[in-house]
């Protein structure tokens, strides 16, 4: 795995995937904090498969966005604000 | 010529999941990134996922992060798009498209139709 150094920190970038000449389109990209600590005693108690340590952490996303019409006639989201904020995760 | 196909949609219930599939032939698979786009009745098309030829590097739409994954196979020139937690909202025709780094998005595959209903 990369050195966390390596990461650049949450920020907007050119989107490489839709961005044209003259006409970048911005998307969030980049690291935010994690964090990892014993679990407290009490949160254990409520656990159906007790784990030893809780992890923390959170994604860069879009805090505001326009939807925007690109050359092919789609539309997709140019960033406008970034923020770190709650990771969702789904089992496949 | 470059030929796309898509498979793997169908009929799902309201948080039901499904994975599509994008076979590409006639290219150098390596030298593209693959995109998945979707277009409802009477919607705009709209990118909903994209990845870059190593994978490491993506895009989602925001309606959609944390619940598709775009991932490929460049060993059997396939992309996938894991779609979990499916909404009614979700049901569009699904196309896989390429594009070149130094070019645009001008292969599209027929589509495959996603229909999210109880």
């Known amino acids: 795995a990369p050195d966390v150094q390596d990461c650049p920190e949450c920020t907007l970038q050119e989107n490489p995937f839709f961005s044209q000449p003259g006409a970048p389109i911005l998307q969030c990209m980049g690291c935010c904090f994690s964090r990892a600590y014993p679990t407290p005693l009490r949160s254990k108690k409520t656990m159906l498969v007790q784990k030893n340590v809780t992890s923390e952490s959170t994604c860069c996303v879009a805090k505001s966005y326009n939807r925007v019409t690109v050359m092919g006639g789609f539309k997709v989201e140019n960033h406008t604000a970034c923020h770190c904020s709650t990771c969702y995760y789904h089992k496949s | 010529q470059v030929q796309l196909q898509e498979s793997g949609g169908e009929l799902v219930q309201p948080g039901g999941s499904l994975k599509l599939s994008c076979a590409a032939s006639g290219l150098t698979f390596t030298n593209y990134s693959m995109g998945w786009f979707r277009q409802a009745p009477g919607v705009d098309r709209e990118a909903v996922a994209a990845i870059s030829w190593s994978g490491d590097n993506t895009y989602y739409v925001s309606s959609v992060k944390g619940r598709f994954t775009i991932s490929r196979d460049n060993a059997k020139n396939t992309v996938y798009l894991q779609m979990n937690s499916l909404k009614p909202q979700d049901t569009a025709v699904y196309y896989c498209?390429?594009?070149?780094?130094?070019?645009?998005?001008?292969?599209w595959g027929q589509g495959t139709q996603v229909t999210v209903s109880s």
């Open positions: 498209a390429v594009k070149p780094d130094d070019g645009w998005w001008d292969y």
